[in-house]
Amino acid sequence: TLNSVLNSNAIKNLPPPLGGAAGHPGSAVSAAPGILYPGGNKYQTIDNYQPYPCAEDEECGTDEYCASPTRGGDAGVQICLACRKRRKRCMRHAMCCPGNYCKNGICVSSDQNNFRGEIEETITESFGNDHSTLDGYSRRTTLSSKMYHSKGQEGSVCLRSSDCATGLCCARHFWSKICKPVLKEGQVCTKHRRKGSHGLEIFQRCYCGEGLSCRIQKDHHQASNSSRLHTCQRH
């Protein structure tokens, strides 16, 4: 169903062109937190990082997972830990940084062939494209040549964040990928659940701006998982 699509964390596992150049560190092509800067939050430094208590992965930032800070430690004391880069050991998808997933105990790059069929099947079922075929989405995001001569303004279609003007990133918005503003403090952000690729996220938000990370709104702890809001908060 569309709800399961929206509540999944397929973004980090999408093949190009949907999720940008997955698995290529430094490629500024993403639409969501963590994809733009695989392997860690660009804005998060060791100096200002404060351990954030958590009970589950989705309470952490996009480039983090929830676990005990010490191996074999007390499961009741868990904090958000930095995600693991490619070739590092893992026990579940959430432990791996965006653009990677856990396979046979190792974080490996999300590979186009692994997910394309599943994504197309999900999106076709959910949206029932009226007058066109999917063709791996390349048809949906092909740009007018004009896009390459001037930076895209808010709401204009894009392929990657570099197509957009300063302060904007390229993010899916229902039907298309468009230039959206980088998020400010207090604005709603998307926290990807990173449980593997179980469909395509129809919407994407930009990442949180400098000095901010996407965390669960404290007054929403009692709400159900699917309705809890995450906002950009100071580290």
Epitope: N3, N7, L143, S144, K146, H173, V188
Partner: antibody
Framework: QVQLVESGGGLVQPGGSLRLSCAAS????????MSWVRQAPGKGLEWVSV??????????YYAASVKGRFTISRDNSKNTLYLQMNSLRAEDTAVYYC?????????WGQGTLVTVSS | DIALTQPASVSGSPGQSITISCTGT?????????VSWYQQHPGKAPKLMIY???NRPSGVSNRFSGSKSGNTASLTISGLQAEDEADYYC???????????FGGGTKLTVLG
């Protein structure tokens, strides 16, 4: 500034046809998805259709109430959006707005009134 | 059919704050952390006031704010002014055939 100007509305009999146009200016038309939204007299807003930024073979979506009767299209060389309405019914009577679909419907035209009546 | 439910009318005095609710289901508003709000003055086209739950487009007063909890979204207008008197519509996305859904609209009256 962004400007959208609809035209083509008027009185038409049930079962008849009408073609609405929307002339766009002030932005790169070919870089935006575009929609039609309508509003029956004294009623709320109802989304009608949307079309991809490309004008040849682009993706289109329709509300269930108009699917099979209405066709959305665009001509990027003319910066114009169209809505071909066939088999019109009394319940299609409304002001039809052309809207730019950027981050949601971020710019709207002034609307054109379509009256379906015998 | 109106997919999202809004109160038909709300009112407030200048300077006060008012909140307009918008209730949907898990198939639309509740299934997305995306909701937009539009302002429409009589005889005019709608204007986007809030998108993505709580984001304001440039040029929209910071007196307008949005929030969402579960299947209900809210638009709050603080420091009510006479020019705020208008109809307000919420909008979300939905699964199924109707991919875009609007609320039935709320008429805001600024008293006095």
């Amino acid at each position: 500034q962004v400007q959208l100007v609809e035209s083509g509305g008027g009185l038409v009999q049930p079962g008849g046809s009408l073609r609405l146009s929307c002339a766009a200016s002030g932005f790169t038309f070919s870089s935006y998805w575009m929609s039609w939204v309508r509003q029956a007299p004294g009623k709320g807003l109802e989304w009608v259709s949307v079309i991809e930024h490309k004008d040849k073979g682009g993706t289109t979506y329709y509300a269930a109430s108009v699917k099979g009767r209405f066709t959305i299209s665009r001509d990027n060389s003319k910066n114009t959006l169209y809505l071909q309405m066939n088999s019109l019914r009394a319940e299609d009577t409304a002001v039809y707005y052309c809207a730019r679909h950027g981050i949601d419907f971020d710019h709207w035209g002034q609307g054109t009134l379509v009256t379906v009546s015998s | 059919d109106i997919a999202l439910t809004q109160p038909a009318s709300v009112s407030g005095s200048p300077g006060q704050s008012i909140t307009i609710s918008c209730t949907g289901t898990s198939s639309d508003l509740g299934g997305y952390n995306y909701v937009s709000w539009y302002q429409q003055h009589p005889g005019k086209a709608p204007k986007l006031m809030i998108y993505d739950v709580n984001n304001r487009p440039s040029g929209v007063s910071n007196r307008f704010s949005g929030s969402k909890s579960g299947n209900t979204a809210s638009l709050t207008i603080s420091g009510l002014q006479a020019e705020d008197e208008a109809d307000y519509y919420c909008q979300s996305y939905a699964s199924g055939n109707t991919k875009v859904v609007f609320g039935g609209g709320t008429k805001l009256t600024v008293l006095g």
